[in-house]
């Protein structure tokens, strides 16, 4: 004889005074059985669209519409996509740190400037947060070279650039 709500499955609710497992009404869910109420399903509207529809056992999941990205736990808000020279972080769009760039609009991460010296070439044009360095032709002279160590903002890590 079932006299308790403990045996109720997800997707149902149950009241102690009338311990019968009842299905969650439409637009509600319960991921744990035996609760006195089902939860109201999340609605994805405005800047949000449905990533996963609500079921009797799981809440809906939202994602952001094109041109926006999620912020916060369970995508609680949408923020405009990042511009070139930025990358997405949990805090939102952040300017690329020194020695890195992102030339993409809306996506991608900041990546290091090309190390021209790897190919024996000089730096023709220095890099920016939006553009990579431009390497010149191969170096033929044997003049002494200087290495500049660029440290990314906020932490250690050297990115060597060869300046001739």
């Amino acid at each position: 004889v079932q006299n308790s709500c403990d045996n109720c499955q997800p997707g149902t609710f149950c009241r102690k005074y009338n311990p019968v497992c009842k299905s969650c009404p439409p637009s509600t869910f319960s991921s744990i059985g035996g609760q006195p109420n089902c939860n109201i399903c999340r609605v994805c509207a405005g800047y949000f669209r449905f990533k996963k529809f609500c079921s009797s056992t799981h809440n809906a999941e939202c994602e952001c519409i094109e041109g926006f990205h999620c912020l916060g736990p369970q995508c609680t808000r949408c923020e405009k996509d990042c511009r070139p020279g930025q990358e997405l972080t949990k805090q939102g769009c952040k300017t690329c740190s020194l020695g890195t760039f992102n030339d993409q609009n809306g996506t991608g991460v900041c990546r290091p400037w090309t190390n021209c010296s790897l190919d024996g070439r000089s730096v023709l044009k220095t890099g920016t947060t939006e553009k990579d360095v431009v390497c010149g032709p191969p170096v033929v002279s044997f003049s002494p070279s200087t290495t500049i160590s660029v440290t990314p903002e906020g932490g250690p890590g050297g990115h060597s650039l060869q300046v001739l």
Epitope: K90, K94, V109, C110, P112, N115, P152, G155, H159
Partner: antibody, heavy 121, light 111 residues
Framework: EVQLVQSGAEVKKPGSSVKVSCKAS????????IYWVRQAPGQGLEWIGN????????FYGEKFMGRATFTADTSTSTAYMELSSLRSEDTAVYYC??????????????WGQGTLVTVSS | SVELTQPPSVSVSPGQTARITCKLN????????VHWYQQKPGQAPVTMIY?????PDGIPERFSGSSDSSSNSAFLTISGVQAEDEADYYC??????????FGGGTKLTVL
């Protein structure tokens, strides 16, 4: 299927160098950072540095600057980590790992199986 | 610089709930993504939780991630712990978007 396959275990003498490889498959090698992380016996995870294989740009942890060198061969989709002037404290399992390009502070979604480097005289 | 502090060990009986803490020493936990890896002896780390609370495909629902701004900590919660969950667990975040930082690891023992 994304895979990172590392080279086999190495035993090295103090003062020598070791070069560990990490062969990537199942994705566009030039579009994701490869990070190098090590783990000494019974210890935690320690960042060595990372490389963007698309242009060979590198970052090194302060502790490893001047001693670690990362390279990438895009023709074989292989990343390399060379560590010079080895000492006994460098005995560790060395891992390569891929970081997705979703955000700048993202997780490592795929790891190599690890390469044990033993430094002993 | 950012440091993540974890308890060296956590013990729990099978079927109970384990909660592993990862405390941020400076800044605000809400400003940093925290990721969690499981590592068993002789194996590479495996992602259990990424971007605070997301579970990769194939990771059981028993594993969940959360954070609390008042204690400036992130949490990995394992409900209904099983013997196979015995492993080392590491939290991971960033000092800058280049520099990853790992917690010291927590050994989970299933009694």
């Amino acid at each position: 299927e994304v895979q990172l396959v590392q080279s086999g275990a190495e035993v090295k003498k103090p003062g020598s160098s070791v070069k560990v490889s990490c062969k990537a498959s199942g994705y566009t090698f030039t579009s994701y950072y490869i990070y190098w992380v090590r783990q000494a016996p019974g210890q935690g995870l320690e960042w060595i540095g990372n490389i963007w294989p698309g242009n060979g740009g590198t970052f090194y942890g302060e502790k490893f600057m001047g001693r670690a060198t990362f390279t990438a061969d895009t023709s074989t989709s292989t990343a390399y980590m060379e560590l010079s002037s080895l000492r006994s404290e460098d005995t560790a399992v060395y891992y390569c790992a891929r970081r997705p390009d979703y955000s700048g502070d993202d997780y490592f979604d795929y790891w190599g199986q690890g390469t044990l480097v033993t430094v002993s005289s | 610089s950012v440091e993540l502090t974890q308890p060296p060990s956590v013990s729990v009986s099978p079927g109970q709930t384990a909660r592993i803490t990862c405390k941020l020493n400076s800044g605000n936990i809400g400003s940093y993504y925290v990721h969690w890896y499981q590592q068993k002896p002789g194996q590479a780390p495996v992602t259990m939780i990424y971007r605070d609370d997301k579970r990769p495909d194939g990771i059981p629902e028993r594993f969940s991630g959360s954070s609390d701004s008042s204690s400036n900590s992130a949490f990995l919660t394992i409900s209904g712990v099983q013997a196979e969950d015995e492993a080392d667990y590491y939290c991971h975040s960033y000092d800058s978007t280049i520099t990853p930082v790992f917690g010291g690891g927590t050994k989970l023992t299933v009694l």
